[in-house]
Amino acid sequence: SEVEYRAEVGQNAYLPCFYTPAAPGNLVPVCWGKGACPVFECGNVVLRTDERDVNYWTSRYWLNGDFRKGDVSLTIENVTLADSGIYCCRIQIPGIMNDEKFNLKLVIKPAKVTPAPTRQRDFTAAFPRMLTTRGHGPAETQTLGSLPDINLTQISTLANELRDSRLANDLRDSGATIRIG
């Protein structure tokens, strides 16, 4: 399923994605990518978490919520029109073919008031049409050893009617829930 979110040029965009850990600290690897979710992982990864921490991120992309409680919503700082497109949130639930993936569409609108000049983005993240070079940076860095016994009960993403980044604060009360197992 795909839900559309909006932000204005120069603002921060918010793309919600949640899961519920079985217990605090029993985290699940999550990746965010620019582009739709492929068969495995995320294409063009912009941020990753592992069982303990955020282990890979790129400029302007961060997690503003408490990811240790399952809030892995992505914040994109100071967006430009080039940030428009599909983003993949993939929750890599341990086991065989257990991943939950969400495609979220970000629409960037021109600013109503021209913002002050800001620093240009470091690279083009649009996938793959504006891609010019390929890197082999970290794809995933997860903790070794035995995996915690995670029995996820739900994964939440934003309900269809929540279309605007400013509604982020209402998310917890309005999220759609997917139950696993």
Epitope: A36, P38, V39, G43
Partner: antibody, heavy 118, light 111 residues
Framework: DVQLVESGGGLVQPGGSRKLSCAAS????????MNWVRQAPEKGLEWVAY????????YYADTVKGRFTISRDNPKNTLFLQMTSLRSEDTAMYYC???????????WGQGTTLTVSS | DIVLTQSPASLAVSLGQRATISCKAS??????????MNWYQQKPGQPPKLLIY???NLESGIPARFSGSGSGTDFTLNIHPVEEEDAATYYC?????????FGGGTKLEIK
């Protein structure tokens, strides 16, 4: 340079078992998902299994589900494929392949040959 | 599963000319205009080698005479001008849906 070296192939009887290994070097093995892809003699390519970097997520092709097990040992930079209940149709060259940033198989080993025959 | 049908199964192209290989998917491998379609080259006795990723992006170190295009269900690999060393079998592969699948291959012979 990225290097993937498979081993463990050979002749196995139908119903038998075999464990393939893939030794990785030249990159941070623990940061990449890995795959096994096979190629029957004079045939095309068939994806077999995928494992995420931390082993949390695993996918199998329907043709091997329940018979093959993919695993990895990150400290030893090694990928494995445990194969059981082998059939003649499992006869193939088995390649390990790294899962790339852009949802592709970006590096491949030279392969190891498995022959299932009585 | 997404079935990828390559054509022709084999072709012979004169040195310096253009080789065109088609790959048709049984369903779209696009999502909002982004295509998870890749192309590989395999020479006898060697493993496959990634040439093109995401439909049209040239892998690092691959000569610019290789190019990919297409969207939806129809994709094309072009090689121009063809060189002797391009004699090989070429495979398309989709990463849009589980399981990842490959085309049947196209064998390129250089005349």
């Amino acid at each position: 340079d990225v290097q993937l070296v498979e081993s463990g192939g050979g002749l196995v009887q139908p119903g038998g078992s075999r464990k393939l290994s893939c030794a990785a070097s030249g990159f941070t093995f623990s940061s990449f998902g890995m795959n096994w892809v096979r190629q029957a003699p004079e045939k095309g390519l068939e994806w077999v299994a995928y494992i995420s970097s931390g082993s949390s997520t695993i996918y199998y092709a329907d043709t091997v589900k329940g018979r093959f097990t993919i695993s990895r040992d990150n400290p030893k930079n090694t990928l494995f494929l445990q194969m059981t209940s082998l059939r003649s149709e499992d006869t193939a060259m088995y390649y390990c392949a790294r899962w790339g940033r852009w949802a592709d198989f970006d590096y491949w080993g030279q392969g190891t040959t498995l022959t299932v025959s009585s | 599963d997404i079935v990828l049908t390559q054509s022709p199964a084999s072709l012979a192209v004169s040195l310096g000319q253009r080789a065109t290989i088609s790959c048709k998917a049984s369903q779209s491998v696009d999502y909002d205009g982004d295509s998870y379609m890749n192309w590989y080259q395999q020479k006898p006795g060697q493993p496959p080698k990634l040439l093109i990723y995401a439909a049209s992006n040239l892998e690092s170190g691959i000569p610019a005479r290789f190019s990919g295009s297409g969207s939806g269900t129809d994709f094309t690999l072009n090689i121009h001008p063809v060189e002797e060393e391009d004699a090989a079998t070429y495979y398309c592969q989709q990463s849009n849906e589980d399981p990842p699948t490959f085309g049947g291959g196209t064998k390129l012979e250089i005349k």
